[in-house]
C-alpha cells in the first residue's frame, strides 16, 4: 500500500513516565506517548511492534501519519481516535498486523482528514457494519477515506463466525454510502468465494481494485460499468475458470483500465472462444502471454494467445441412454 | 453459560515453573476473551493476563510480564497460563474467566472458574 513513510527527522522516544503521568490531561503539543517514535517535523509517530492493548490516549495533535502496526490492539471501540483537540491532522493510519479481531461502529469518527487507512492481517472476525461509516443512517456523512487497505483480514477458517465472511466485509463498505470518494481499494488473500454483485456500483471513485489470491470463481454477476475510472484491477491468483462476453465488454468499455488475470485455473474447452478472440485484440490484459490453461488435461500449460477455435471443444454431452455407470 | 475448570495448582519453590489450564465445557462464542485473575486472602481479585480466541491477542500485568505466558488451544477450547521464574508473592489463587470485553477488569469477565490454588515457597 501507499502509506506515508517518515522523512529522515529526528524521531523522539518518550519515557514511559512522562505518558502515564500527564495521559488524563491534553497532551503538550510536543508530547510523545510511552512505547513510541515521534517527528513533529515528519508529523509522524511510530508505535511499532510494542504490544501496545490500546491506541495511546496522549497522540500529539500535530500527527499525521499514524504506525500502530504489530501490536495487540484486539479491539477498536467506537471514537477510538477521539480526541480533545481532534486529531485533525491525522491522514494515514497503519494498523496492520495488530491482532484485531473486531472493529466497532464509529471507530474511525472525529478524524476529518483521514484520507489512507490500512488495516491488512488483521482476523476481523467482527468488522461492523458502521465501522466506516459511523453512523446506522441510511445515508452517513462522506467518509474523507480514498485509500482503504484490506489484505489478509479473514480469520482462520476455525475462528470465523458462522456468517458470510464477504457479506461482513461488504456490508461495512456500503453502509450509508460513506466511501462513495474512495479510490483504491485493496482485498487481497481473503478466502472470498464470490464478490456481492452490488459492491462495485456503490463505489464509484474507485481507480485501484485489488482482489488478488482469492478464491473467486466467476465473474459473471459482478458489473464493472459504473466503474469508469477504474485504472488498476488486480484478479492474479483466484479461481477463474473463464470471463464471459458481458465482463469482456465491460471490461473493454472502461477508458483507463489495466487488468491483471496471472495464475487462474483458465478452462480451455469450447466456453473459452470468446475470452481467447478477445484477448488476441485487447490492450488492456497485461501479461496476457502468460495466460495458460489448467483444464483439461490435454490442454494444461497451453497458451490462451495461441489457441484457435479448433483447439477449443467441449466433449459431447451423452444422452441418459446411452452414458455408460 | 460456559463451564470453566482450573487445573495444575501446587507447590513450586521460588525460581520455579508451573502451567495452569483452564478447559471450557464449550467454545464461548459470546466470551471473546478468556483471562486469569488471581487473589490472596483479604484483597480484590487481580488481573494477570488475556487472551483473545480470534486472533490471539495478549496483554498482561506490569507484574508478571516476561515471566508468564497466556496463550490459547481453539481446538480443546483450553486456555493457558505458563509461569517461570515464581516468586513468592505470586502465591495466590488463580482464577480462569471469559467476557465481551478487552479489559482488565473484574467486572470485564461475566463467567468464573473455581480457582486453583499455587503456593510459591521461598
Known amino acids: 500500500s501507499s502509506s506515508p513513510t517518515s522523512s529522515a527527522s529526528s524521531f523522539s522516544s518518550s519515557a514511559p513516565f512522562l505518558a502515564s503521568a500527564v495521559s488524563a490531561q491534553p497532551p503538550l503539543p510536543d508530547q510523545c506517548p510511552a512505547l513510541c517514535e515521534c517527528s513533529e517535523a515528519a508529523r509522524t509517530v511510530k508505535c511499532v511492534n510494542r504490544n501496545l492493548t490500546e491506541v495511546p490516549t496522549d497522540l500529539p495533535a500535530y500527527v499525521r501519519n499514524l504506525f500502530l502496526t504489530g501490536n495487540q490492539l484486539a479491539v477498536l471501540p467506537a471514537g477510538a481516535f477521539a480526541r480533545r483537540p481532534p486529531l485533525a491532522e491525522l491522514a494515514a493510519l497503519n494498523l496492520s498486523g495488530s491482532r484485531l479481531d473486531e472493529v466497532r461502529a464509529g471507530a474511525f469518527e472525529h478524524l476529518p482528514s483521514l484520507r489512507q487507512l490500512d488495516l491488512s492481517h488483521n482476523p476481523l472476525a467482527d468488522l461492523s457494519p458502521f465501522a466506516f461509516s459511523g453512523s446506522n443512517a441510511s445515508v452517513s456523512a462522506p467518509s474523507p477515506l480514498v485509500e482503504l487497505i484490506l489484505n489478509h483480514i479473514v480469520p482462520p477458517e476455525d475462528e470465523r463466525q458462522n456468517r458470510s465472511f464477504e457479506g461482513m466485509v461488504v456490508a461495512a463498505l456500503l453502509a450509508g454510502r460513506a466511501l462513495q470518494g474512495l479510490r483504491r481499494l485493496e482485498l487481497a488473500s481473503n478466502h472470498f468465494l464470490y464478490l456481492p454483485r452490488d459492491v462495485l456500483a456503490q463505489l464509484p471513485s474507485l481507480r485501484h481494485l485489488d482482489l488478488s489470491n482469492n478464491s473467486l470463481v466467476s465473474l459473471t454477476y459482478v458489473s464493472f460499468r459504473n466503474l469508469t475510472h477504474l485504472e488498476s484491477l488486480h484478479l492474479e491468483d483466484n479461481a477463474l475458470k473463464v470471463l464471459h462476453n458481458g465482463t469482456l465488454a465491460e471490461l473493454q468499455g472502461l477508458p483507463h483500465i489495466r487488468v491483471f488475470l496471472d495464475n487462474n485455473p483458465w478452462v480451455c474447452d469450447c466456453h473459452m472462444a470468446d475470452m481467447v478472440t478477445w484477448l488476441k485484440e485487447t490492450e488492456v490484459v497485461q501479461g496476457k502471454d502468460r495466460l495458460t490453461c489448467a483444464y483439461p488435461e490435454k490442454m494444461r500449460n497451453r497458451v490462451l494467445l495461441e489457441l484457435n477455435s479448433a483447439d477449443l471443444d467441449c466433449d459431447p454431452i451423452l444422452p441418459p441412454s446411452l452414458q455408460t455407470s | 453459560e460456559v463451564q470453566l475448570v482450573e487445573s495444575g495448582g501446587g507447590e513450586v519453590q521460588a525460581g520455579g515453573s508451573l502451567r495452569l489450564s483452564c478447559a471450557a465445557s464449550r467454545r464461548p462464542f459470546s466470551s471473546k476473551t478468556m483471562a486469569w485473575f488471581r487473589q490472596t486472602p483479604g484483597k480484590e481479585r487481580e488481573f494477570v493476563a488475556a487472551?483473545?480466541?480470534?486472533?490471539?491477542?495478549?496483554r498482561y500485568a506490569e507484574s508478571v510480564k516476561g515471566r508468564f505466558t497466556i496463550s490459547r488451544d481453539n481446538a480443546k477450547n483450553t486456555v493457558y497460563l505458563q509461569m517461570s521464574s515464581l516468586r513468592a508473592e505470586d502465591t495466590a489463587v488463580y482464577y480462569c474467566a471469559a467476557g465481551q470485553a478487552w479489559g482488565t477488569k473484574f467486572t470485564d469477565y461475566s463467567d468464573w472458574g473455581q480457582g486453583t490454588l499455587v503456593t510459591v515457597k521461598p
Open positions: 487472551v483473545r480466541w480470534i486472533g490471539g491477542a495478549t
